[in-house]
Interface confidence: medium
């Protein structure tokens, strides 16, 4: 196809390559999340870090374990979503199950869609393992009604 992306050199499976951004990632593709009047789209992201163990330290934001993991994850997301539309992340939560990470990503409206959020995150998994020693699996992305509006969107995950 005529347009390619430097960060998207090969296809592996659809879960890591769906709907790669069409113009360069400065204006990527699709968000089902409702938008605020300020023009922000939100996505809920969940993934497992299978090489870490959950313990009570991850329930206490003052612990070193919590803060180091939060810092690594925050830094990782700044690396993954370098394009101008990424506004940041919030509401990081850690859950049992190795370590399950849940967080909310914010993007400028119209700059990315849920599939590209997932695509770019999946494509970073290898680098996450080498750079941060985080083995990531079970990635799930969905649109979020924020701030907690009634209905997210009409895309029904199976």
């Amino acid at each position: 196809t005529p347009t390619t992306l430097a960060s998207h050199s090969t296809k592996t499976d659809a879960s890591s390559t769906h709907h790669s951004s069409v113009p360069p990632l400065t204006s990527s593709n699709h968000s089902t999340s409702p938008q605020l009047s300020t023009g922000v789209s939100f996505f809920f992201l969940s993934f497992h870090i299978s090489n870490l163990q959950f313990n009570s330290s991850l329930e206490d934001p003052s612990t070193d374990y919590y803060q180091e993991l939060q810092r690594d994850i925050s830094e990782m997301f700044l690396q993954i979503y370098k394009q101008g539309g990424f506004l940041g992340l919030s509401n990081i939560k850690f859950r049992p199950g190795s370590v399950v990470v849940q967080l909310t990503l914010a993007f400028r409206e119209g700059t990315i869609n849920v599939h590209d959020v997932e695509t770019q995150f999946n494509q970073y998994k290898t680098e996450a393992a080498s750079r941060y020693n985080l083995t990531i699996s079970d990635v799930s992305v969905s649109d979020v009604p924020f701030p907690f509006s009634a209905q997210s969107g009409a895309g029904v995950p199976g």
Partner: antibody, heavy 119, light 107 residues
């Protein structure tokens, strides 16, 4: 060259279920999400849903959530759509379509299966 | 659901004329708009993706433009073989939706 092969036509009775098939060739089946699109006679296009062949993950149009079930068979590079409780409203051409490399659109289309629901 | 509104519903043009089809989204869809051509008794074919990227093998007389809510497909010099229905579609927000189509007839 990517090809999506679909049966030309199916005739079923009201109230029955029908499974439509789509066989892919010419590309790595698991690399591209597969979509299904409905077109009633003389009408426009309606997206039913999509399935990720690599892990079976699906997204549905809410309007079809109770009507359609999407599945894939990685080994035969085939996608299927089961339609249930068929009525005359379901008479339409059903297309399978798939992504292309770095394309957020339906790059490849099957020829479509004409489903006729009639007693 | 995002509504894609196409205009005009139909048009009749002479060979060599410039054709402009428009598509308006009910919400911001970024550049996640594709254009499809469907000739009589055929499957749709992808012409333009990402609002302005011409798909492989599509003649360069077809040009897409626009972003956010307003999109245009232009055929710089229409040919007899361009007789078809043209649909825009968005892949920004679930469910993916299409416009109602524009029927292009050749005089």
């Amino acid at each position: 060259q990517v090809q999506l092969q679909q049966p030309g036509a199916e005739l079923v009775k009201p109230g029955a279920s029908e499974k439509l098939s789509c066989k892919a060739s010419g590309h790595t089946f698991t690399s591209y999400w597969m979509h299904w699109v409905k077109q009633r006679p003389g009408q426009g296009l309606e997206w039913i849903g999509e399935i990720n062949p690599s892990n079976g993950r699906t997204y549905y149009n809410e309007n079809f959530k109770t009507k359609a079930t999407l599945t894939v068979d990685k080994y035969s590079s085939s996608a299927s759509m089961q339609l249930r409780s068929l009525t005359s409203e379901d008479s339409a051409v059903y297309y399978c379509a798939s992504d292309g490399d770095y394309v957020s659109g339906f790059a490849y289309w099957g020829q479509g299966t004409t489903l006729t629901v009639s007693s | 659901n995002i509504v894609m509104t196409q205009s005009p519903k139909s048009m009749s043009m002479s060979v060599g004329e410039r054709v402009t089809l428009t598509c308006k989204a009910s919400e911001n869809v970024g550049t996640y708009v594709s254009w499809y051509q469907q000739k009589p008794e055929q499957s749709p074919k992808l012409l333009i993706y990402g609002a302005s990227n011409r798909y492989t093998g599509v003649p360069n007389r077809f040009t897409g433009s626009g972003s956010a809510t307003d999109f245009t497909l232009t055929i710089s010099s229409v040919q007899a073989e361009d007789l078809a229905d043209y649909y825009c579609g968005q892949s920004y927000s679930y469910p993916w939706t299409f416009g109602g189509g524009t029927k292009l007839e050749i005089k």
